[in-house]
C-alpha cells in the first residue's frame, strides 16, 4: 500500500472580505486512521483552525461529509473572511493514538484577502486662508488589501500634481492604510470649488471611491469697500453708502464712524450672493449736514469673519451745502480704501437689498 499523501491542490486562494474561503484538501489513503486538522501557519505558534476530532469552530464547515465511508476529502469552508484571516493554511493528517500524533502535512494554501478601502476622508486646514495662499488637504483610507492602490487628487475635475502619498505599513500586513497630503493654491473664485481624493483598488472593480472637501469650508475672501455719497434726499441731509463687495463667508459686522465716533453698528444679514459664491452688502448713513460746523470724516469699518477690521473713509465738506438734489459738488469724496483693495464692478450681482 502506498503511504498516505495530503494533497492541497491550491497554492494560493484569494477571497473578498465578507465572503467564504474554500480550502481544498484530500488524502490519498484511508490508512492510517486518524483525524484531520487545519492550521494557519507552521511551527509551534501555529493556530488551530479546525479539528475533525474535537472542538467548536463556528466559522468552519466541512465541504464534504467527513463521516461518510471512504471519505478522503477534508476541504473546509471558512465563513465571513476578514483581512485578519490571511495566511498560509495547512491540512494535517494525524494518526490515531493516545494522544493522536501528527502524521503528514499538506504543502499549504496561502489565503489572501481582498478588502475594500474605507471611504476616503478628506480634511482641510483648521483655519481659513485667503486667496493666493497654499493650503494642505489630507486624505485617509484604511483597511484595504492587497497593498497596491492608486490615489489621485482633483480640484474641480482637474488633476492635481503637488501631493505626497504613503501606504502603511511598509512590510507584510493583513490590511493597509493610505495617507496623502495635497497642496492647493486658493483663488478668489474657489468658494464653490471642491477638492476630491479618489482611491482606486482591485476590490472596487473600476469604480473608485471618492472623498470630497468643499473649499467653502477653507477659504476666506476679504471684502472690498467703496464709500460713495448719494444725491441729497432732503435739505441738509446727505446719504452716504458703503458697498461691501465679494466677501466670504457671510459673517460680517459694519460700523459707521463720524469723526472717529461710533454712529451705528450692524451685522450683515440680507446679502446679495454673487455667481462665484461670494457676497455683497450695502449699508448707508443719512448725515444731517446742518448739525455739523466743520467737515465730517465718515468711516465705514468692517470686521469680517473675526479678522482685524478694514475701513474706508469719506470726507464731507460742510462749508458749502448742496443746493439741489442730485448734485455732488458740495461734498468731495476723498476717501481711500485703507486695505488697498481694488474696486469690483458688480455685473454679477443677482439682486440688491438696501439696509438702513
Amino acid at each position: 500500500e502506498e503511504e498516505l499523501q495530503v494533497i492541497q491542490p491550491d497554492k494560493s486562494v484569494s477571497v473578498a472580505a465578507g465572503e467564504s474561503a474554500i480550502l481544498h484538501c484530500t488524502v490519498t489513503s484511508l490508512i492510517p486512521v486518524g483525524p484531520i486538522q487545519w492550521f494557519r501557519g507552521a511551527g509551534p505558534a501555529r493556530e488551530l483552525i479546525y479539528n475533525q476530532k474535537e472542538g467548536h469552530f463556528p466559522r468552519v464547515t466541512t465541504v464534504s461529509e467527513s463521516t461518510k465511508r471512504e471519505n478522503m476529502d477534508f476541504s473546509i469552508s471558512i465563513s465571513n473572511i476578514t483581512p485578519a484571516d490571511a495566511g498560509t493554511y495547512y491540512c494535517v493528517k494525524f494518526r490515531k493514538g493516545s494522544p493522536d500524533t501528527e502524521f503528514k502535512s499538506g504543502a499549504g494554501t496561502e489565503l489572501s484577502v481582498r478588502a475594500k478601502p474605507s471611504a476616503p476622508v478628506v480634511s482641510g486646514p483648521a483655519a481659513r486662508a485667503t486667496p493666493q495662499h497654499t493650503v494642505s488637504f489630507t486624505c485617509e483610507s484604511h483597511g484595504f488589501s492587497p497593498r497596491d492602490i492608486t490615489l489621485k487628487w482633483f480640484k474641480n475635475g482637474n488633476e492635481l500634481s503637488d501631493f505626497q502619498t504613503n501606504v502603511d505599513p511598509v512590510g507584510e500586513s493583513v490590511s493597509y492604510s493610505i495617507h496623502s497630503t495635497a497642496k492647493v493654491v486658493l483663488t478668489r473664485e474657489d468658494v464653490h470649488s471642491q477638492v476630491i481624493c479618489e482611491v482606486a483598488h482591485v476590490t472596487l472593480q473600476g469604480d473608485p471611491l471618492r472623498g470630497t472637501a468643499n473649499l467653502s469650508e477653507t477659504i476666506r475672501v476679504p471684502p472690498t469697500l467703496e464709500v460713495t455719497q448719494q444725491p441729497v434726499r432732503a435739505e441738509n441731509q446727505v446719504n452716504v453708502t458703503c458697498q461691501v463687495r465679494k466677501f466670504y463667508p457671510q459673517r460680517l459686522q459694519l460700523t459707521w464712524l463720524e469723526n472717529g465716533n461710533v454712529s451705528r453698528t450692524e451685522t450683515a444679514s440680507t446679502v446679495t450672493e454673487n455667481k462665484d459664491g461670494t457676497y455683497n452688502w450695502m449699508s448707508w448713513l443719512l448725515v444731517n449736514v446742518s448739525a455739523h460746523r466743520d467737515d465730517v470724516k465718515l468711516t465705514c469699518q468692517v470686521e469680517h469673519d473675526g479678522q482685524p477690521a478694514v475701513s474706508k473713509s469719506h470726507d464731507l465738506k460742510v462749508s458749502a451745502h448742496p443746493k439741489e438734489q442730485g448734485s455732488n459738488t458740495a461734498a468731495e469724496n476723498t476717501g481711500s480704501n485703507e486695505r488697498g483693495s481694488s474696486d469690483y464692478k458688480d455685473d454679477d450681482d443677482k439682486h440688491h437689498h438696501h439696509h438702513h
Epitope: S66, T67, R69
Partner: antibody
Framework: QVQLVQSGAEVKKPGASVKVSCKAS????????INWVRQAPGQGLEWIAM????????HYNQIFKDRATLTTDTSTSTAYMELRSLRSDDTAVYYC????????????WGRGTLVTVSS | DIVLTQSPDSLAVSLGERATINCRAS??????????IFWYQQKPGQPPKLLIY???NRDSGVPDRFSGSGSGTDFTLTISSLQAEDVAVYYC????????FGQGTKLEIK
C-alpha cells in the same frame, strides 16, 4: 481522550422495551459513527446497528430492523438504542462503540450495559 | 450478507510460540483497493479492543508481535511470540458490506 459511558444494568420482563444510553466525550460527537453491538453470555459479538449523529443516518442488521431504534441527542452527545418486544434470548451485554475512521469499524468501546430479560 | 468463519474455534499455544488464527469470508471483502477486515481482542469482563484494521494495519498502541495479512476472502491474524497477556478471544469483522463478526477464536496457553 475518547470516552463512552453507558447507562446501568437493566432487568426487563419479556415483551417490554429497554433503552440503553451511551454518553460520549473527548471528541466531536457529530463527526463519528456510533455502533451498537451485543454479546450474549458466553457467546460471540453480534452487530445490531450504527448511526451517524450528524444527520441520523442509520444502518441496521436485518435481524434487528423491526425491533431496534437508534437515536441521538447532539445537545448532550448521547446515543440511544431502544430494543422492543424483549425476549429471554435478548439477555446480553450491549455495547456502544465509536468508529474513528468511518471504516464501519469499532475503535473505542463503552464498558457495556447488561440487559437481563426474565419473567 | 457476508458470513465470516474463523478457525480454529480454540487454540492453545506455548508461551513464546507463534499463534495463527484464520478468518474466511463467504465472498470477497476487497473494495476500492482495501481489504475490509478488522481484528479484535476481548479479554474476560472487558469490551473488545481493536487490534488490526483494513486487514494489515496495527491500531495505535498494539504491540508489533501482532500482525494481519490476507486479501480477498482469506485472512490471518498472527501473534509472533505469544505472551501471557495475549490470552483472550479474538474476533474478525468485515465491513465490505454492513458489519458482521466471525464467531470468535479462544486463545489459551499450552
Amino acid at each position: 481522550q475518547v470516552q463512552l459511558v453507558q447507562s446501568g444494568a437493566e432487568v426487563k420482563k419479556p415483551g417490554a422495551s429497554v433503552k440503553v444510553s451511551c454518553k460520549a466525550s473527548g471528541y466531536t460527537f457529530t463527526n463519528y459513527w456510533i455502533n451498537w453491538v451485543r454479546q450474549a453470555p458466553g457467546q460471540g459479538l453480534e452487530w445490531i446497528a450504527m448511526i451517524d449523529p450528524s444527520d441520523s443516518e442509520t444502518h441496521y442488521n436485518q435481524i434487528f430492523k423491526d425491533r431496534a431504534t437508534l437515536t441521538t441527542d447532539t445537545s448532550t452527545s448521547t446515543a440511544y438504542m431502544e430494543l422492543r418486544s424483549l425476549r429471554s434470548d435478548d439477555t446480553a451485554v450491549y455495547y456502544c462503540a465509536m468508529d474513528y475512521g468511518s471504516l464501519y469499524a469499532m475503535d473505542y468501546w463503552g464498558r457495556g450495559t447488561l440487559v437481563t430479560v426474565s419473567s | 450478507d457476508i458470513v465470516l468463519t474463523q478457525s480454529p474455534d480454540s487454540l492453545a499455544v506455548s508461551l513464546g510460540e507463534r499463534a495463527t488464527i484464520n478468518c474466511r469470508a463467504s465472498k470477497s471483502v476487497s473494495s476500492s483497493g482495501y481489504n475490509w477486515i478488522f481484528w479484535y481482542q476481548q479479554k474476560p469482563g472487558q469490551p473488545p479492543k481493536l487490534l488490526i484494521y483494513l486487514a494489515s494495519n496495527r491500531d495505535s498502541g498494539v504491540p508489533d508481535r501482532f500482525s494481519g495479512s490476507g486479501s480477498g476472502t482469506d485472512f490471518t491474524l498472527t501473534i509472533s511470540s505469544l505472551q501471557a497477556e495475549d490470552v483472550a478471544v479474538y474476533y474478525c469483522q468485515e465491513s465490505r458490506e454492513l458489519p458482521t463478526f466471525g464467531q470468535g477464536t479462544k486463545l489459551e496457553i499450552k
